[in-house]
């Protein structure tokens, strides 16, 4: 189980992870205390039929071609939460572990 | 958390969950000896902005826009094993809880 | 309770400054963006400017651009604009709204303080 | 610039009526916008962000829909009280711009 890591240089052309970071405050999300800022990643590229694909079943499903189904997308495989400090809506705050908040790898499904 | 279901009648334009019935020996796939046919739907739709976003990255990369990040694209985001009776490479009779084989829920990321 | 009251409005020659604040309580002030709105009698609601919390994020309305300036004092919990040049279509109510942002927008505003460009 | 087109600009209704009034934004927004009530001499007050998700305190005659371009604020059945003008406002990109207004009088 693996996937490609990528940055601003590289010149491929398949799924890949890319670095990216997300600042909160230039969201206007500046009721998030901590983190500031984190590192998020995200997918990008081409999903070549069977080139990073996590499970049987995207193979399955291509190889059936049920109506409207379309290729594999380049998308998060895994995903792991980071922990943040922020003002909820009524003004408490809140310290809580968000899910999915870091892509960890990218493959086509 | 939810999806839509959907069926070959509907209408639905959205990113949705389709039944799809593989069967292994339509597809050559003579060594899996039960089952021989499966239920394993499949995701197929549009990915509109916001709808059945399973997560809030997937908010953010959007706003970010990197360069050649896509948009969010229909994908599973629930899956569950089908226990399998098959032969391996070495003629053995394995018998398995085969990961990511059924599509439960379809999204947006 | 979560307040926004705003002050410094009043009466000004065309061409002259004024400068106006908005005084926030009840919520953590330097949390959160903040925006100047305004509207002239018997007409619609404008955008005038935005400030993010620590300010590294200021934007402005074309129509005010190099005559009004945005800026806040944490501190003091008061979001301020300094208006330069003021002409008789600055004429309108002034209100300060706080923003959580994208996705989220303006919740909260003040009860606006009234601004007069006149000779 | 992000232009926000409010139809119509002013409707007279009773009350018990259900209303309608649409946003339509000159590029996609996504859902990043709000309505707004406002009140002779009063400051706005929020109805709905997100498109469709309702502001806590207020009644739940009060709807949103629509994503990208096409935004609908629906009033179920139209109270005394809810007489008033209402906004939208974009806050997908600078400059924030809002609609022009709809006027909700008295038939």
């Known amino acids: 189980d693996f996937g490609l890591d990528c940055d601003e240089h590289s010149t491929e052309s398949r799924c890949c992870r890319y670095p990216l970071t997300v600042d909160f405050e230039a969201f206007g999300w500046d009721w998030i205390i901590a983190p500031k800022r984190y590192k998020a990643n995200y997918c990008s590229g081409e999903c070549e039929f069977v080139f990073l694909q996590k499970y049987p079943h995207t193979h399955l499903v291509h190889q059936a071609n049920p109506r409207g189904s379309a290729g594999p997308c380049c998308t998060p495989t895994k995903m792991s939460p980071i922990n943040m400090l922020y003002f909820n809506g009524k003004e408490q705050i809140i310290y809580g572990k968000i899910p999915a908040m870091v892509v960890d790898r990218c493959g086509c499904s | 958390d939810f999806g839509l279901d959907c069926d070959e009648h509907s209408t639905e334009s959205r990113c949705c969950r389709y039944p799809l019935t593989v069967d292994f020996e339509a597809f050559g796939w003579d060594w899996i000896i039960a089952p021989k046919r499966y239920k394993a739907n499949y995701c197929s739709g549009e990915c509109e902005f916001v709808f059945l976003q399973k997560y809030p990255h997937t908010h953010l990369v959007h706003q970010a826009n990197p360069r050649g990040s896509a948009g969010p694209c229909c994908t599973p985001t629930k899956m569950s094993p089908i226990n399998m009776l098959y032969f391996n490479g070495k003629e053995q009779i394995i018998y398995g809880k085969i990961p990511a084989m059924v599509v439960d829920r379809c999204g947006c990321s | 309770e979560v307040q926004l009251v705003e002050s410094g409005g009043g009466l000004v020659k065309p061409g002259g400054s004024l400068r106006l604040s908005c005084a926030a309580s009840g919520f953590t002030f330097s949390s959160y963006s903040m925006n100047w709105v305004r509207q002239a009698p018997g007409k619609g609601l404008e955008w005038v400017s935005s400030i993010s919390s620590s300010s590294s994020y200021i934007y402005y309305a074309d129509s005010v651009k190099g005559r009004f300036t945005i800026s806040r004092d944490n501190a003091k919990n008061s979001l301020y604009l300094q208006m330069n040049s003021l002409r008789a279509e600055d004429t309108t109510v002034y209100y300060c709204?706080?923003?959580?942002?994208?996705?989220?927008?303006?919740?909260?505003w003040g009860q606006g303080t009234t601004v007069t460009v006149s000779s | 610039d992000i232009q926000m087109t409010q139809s119509p600009s002013s409707l007279s209704a009773s009350v018990g009526d259900r209303v309608t009034i649409t946003c339509r934004a000159s590029q996609a927004i996504r859902n990043d916008l709000g309505w707004y009530q406002q009140k002779p001499g009063k400051a706005p007050k929020r109805l709905i962000y997100a498109a469709s998700s309702l502001q806590s305190g207020v009644p739940s005659r009060f709807s949103g829909s629509g994503s990208g371009t096409e935004f609908t604020l629906t009033i179920s059945s139209l109270q005394p009280e809810d007489f008033a003008t209402y906004y939208c406002?974009?806050?997908?990109?600078?400059?924030?711009?809002f609609g022009q207004g709809t006027k909700v009088e008295i038939k």
């Open positions: 709204a706080r923003d959580r942002g994208y996705l989220y927008g303006m919740d909260v």
């Open positions: 406002l974009q806050h997908n990109s600078y400059p924030r711009t």
